[in-house]
C-alpha cells in the first residue's frame, strides 16, 4: 500500500533508501531542456515476487527543443535550494542487496534524468538520513524513518536527527567516512 505522504523533512539533511519495496514508484523526470517521451510511462515501478524484484517500465527523455509547439516538458525545477528527497545516484549498491526479498536495487540512471529523484514509497519502507555537507549529526536516536500503517492511515516515524552547522558529515548505517566523494556521498553501502 502506497504511503500517503513523503518522509519527514529534517533541516540540512537528505534521506535515501538502501532498497525499495515492491510497489514503489519512481517518477520519470527529465533534466531541464528534456521531456518524457510522449509514449513514455509516468513512472518506473518496483515489481516482482518474493524471489525476484525488478523495475518495470523504462524512463526515457527526449530533447524539448520543439517545446513551443509540443509543450511537453518534464523539468528539473529551477530552484532546488536543499535536496529534501532522494537524489539521483549511480547504482552503488551493497553486494547482498539483491537477496533482500521483495525489494529492488537503486535503478541505474537514465539518459538526461533530472538530478533529483521523486519516489512514492510503500508501507514498510525505511529511509535513512544523513546531514548534508558542512553539517554534523547530533543523534538522539535512530536517524531513520519508517512508513507505518496505523488505523487505516499511513504515517512516517520521526527520525531522531539534528544537523548542526559544523564541518563533519555523518554517514548512512554501516558506511565508512567518504573520501572526496561529491556532496559527502559514500562510495559504498551496506544493506539495511
Amino acid at each position: 500500500e502506497l504511503c500517503d505522504d513523503d518522509p519527514p523533512e529534517i533541516p540540512h539533511a537528505t534521506f535515501k533508501a538502501m532498497a525499495y519495496k515492491e510497489g514503489t514508484m519512481l517518477n520519470c523526470e527529465c533534466k531541464r531542456g528534456f521531456r518524457r517521451i510522449k509514449s513514455g510511462s509516468l513512472y518506473m515501478l518496483c515489481t516482482g515476487n518474493s524471489s525476484h524484484s525488478s523495475w518495470d517500465n523504462q524512463c526515457q527523455c527526449t530533447s524539448s527543443a520543439t517545446r513551443n509547439t509540443t509543450k511537453q516538458v518534464t523539468p528539473q525545477p529551477e530552484e532546488q535550494k536543499e535536496r529534501k528527497t532522494t537524489e539521483m545516484q549511480s547504482p552503488m549498491q551493497p553486494v547482498d542487496q539483491a537477496s533482500l526479498p521483495g525489494h529492488c536495487r537503486e535503478p541505474p540512471p537514465w539518459e538526461n534524468e533530472a538530478t533529483e529523484r521523486i519516489y512514492h514509497f510503500v508501507v514498510g519502507q525505511m529511509v535513512y538520513y544523513q546531514c548534508v555537507q558542512g553539517y554534523r549529526a547530533l543523534h538522539r536516536g535512530p536517524a531513520e524513518s519508517v512508513c507505518k500503517m496505523t488505523h487505516g492511515k499511513t504515517r512516517w516515524t520521526q527520525p531522531q536527527l539534528i544537523c548542526t552547522g559544523e564541518m563533519e558529515t555523518s554517514q548512512f548505517p554501516g558506511e565508512e567516512k567518504p573520501q572526496a566523494s561529491p556532496e559527502g556521498r559514500p562510495e559504498s553501502e551496506t544493506s539495511c
Partner: antibody, heavy 114, light 107 residues
C-alpha cells in the same frame, strides 16, 4: 495531510473566460505535477493536461489547446486553470489531481449560461 | 489516442457477491492502468495503480489484474458502500485517457 483545495462554483456567460484555482497542502508543491480533469454527465472523465509547478512546464491534451491555460504560483502553492471562449460544452466539473493521480481536489463546477 | 472501453455501463450485484469490472485498451499499455471509484457528488478516489497495486486505505476486497490490453477490477464480498461508478485510466502515453465508467448498483 495532503490536500488539494479547489475554488468554488462558477456561473459564467458564453464567450467569456473563467479562472479556477487548486491550492496544494501537505507535500512539496514543486516536486509533483498537477493535472486537470474535466467531467461532464454522459461524457465521463477527460484529461485536460498538467503542469509542473517547479518550472511551470505544461502538457496539454490536443483537444484543449487554446481552451485551457495552466499557471502556478509557488509562493502560495496554488495552480490555476483558465478556460477561454466559453460555450455550453464547457459546462462541467473540473478536478485538479496530483501525486500521479493519487490525490484529487473536490472539483469546481462551471456553468456556462446566458 | 488510446481508447479505454468499459463495455458494461451498469452492473447489478448483491451484498456479499463478487463482481468484476472490465476495461479494454485499444493498444498495449503494459500495466500502466489505474482504477478509480466515484460516489455521487464526490471526486474520484484512487483505488489501484499499476493495474494491481492498492492505494493505502483501500479495502483488500478490491483487487486489480491484467496487463497489455485487458484489465479487471474485482470486488469480492460487495458492500453497500461500494455503490459507485468505477473508471479505469491509462497513463502509458499522452494524452492520458479514461474509460467511460461502470456504475455498480446494489440489488
Amino acid at each position: 495531510q495532503i490536500q488539494l483545495q479547489q475554488s468554488g462554483a462558477e456561473l459564467v456567460r458564453p464567450g467569456t473566460s473563467v479562472k479556477m484555482s487548486c491550492k496544494a497542502a501537505g507535500y512539496t508543491f514543486t516536486n509533483y505535477w498537477i493535472g486537470w480533469v474535466k467531467q461532464r454527465p454522459g461524457h465521463g472523465l477527460e484529461w485536460i493536461g498538467d503542469i509542473h509547478p517547479g518550472g511551470s512546464y505544461t502538457n496539454y491534451n490536443e483537444n484543449f489547446k487554446g481552451k485551457a491555460t495552466f499557471t502556478a504560483d509557488t509562493s502560495s502553492s496554488t495552480t490555476y486553470m483558465q478556460l477561454s471562449s466559453l460555450t455550453s460544452e464547457d459546462s462541467a466539473i473540473y478536478f485538479c489531481t496530483s501525486r500521479n493521480f493519487a490525490k484529487w481536489g473536490q472539483g469546481t463546477p462551471v456553468t456556462v449560461s446566458s | 489516442d488510446i481508447v479505454l472501453t468499459q463495455s458494461q455501463k451498469f452492473m447489478s450485484t448483491s451484498v456479499g457477491d463478487r463482481v468484476s469490472v472490465t476495461c479494454k485498451a485499444s493498444q498495449n499499455v503494459g500495466t500502466n492502468v489505474a482504477w478509480y471509484q466515484q460516489k455521487p457528488g464526490q471526486s474520484p478516489k484512487a483505488l489501484i495503480y499499476s493495474a494491481s497495486y492498492r492505494y493505502s486505505g483501500v479495502p483488500d476486497r478490491f483487487t486489480g489484474s491484467g496487463s497489455g490490453t485487458d484489465f479487471t477490477l474485482t470486488i469480492s464480498n460487495v458492500q453497500s458502500e461500494d455503490l459507485a461508478e468505477y473508471f479505469c485510466q491509462q497513463y502509458n502515453s499522452y494524452p492520458y485517457t479514461f474509460g467511460g465508467g461502470t456504475k455498480l448498483e446494489i440489488k
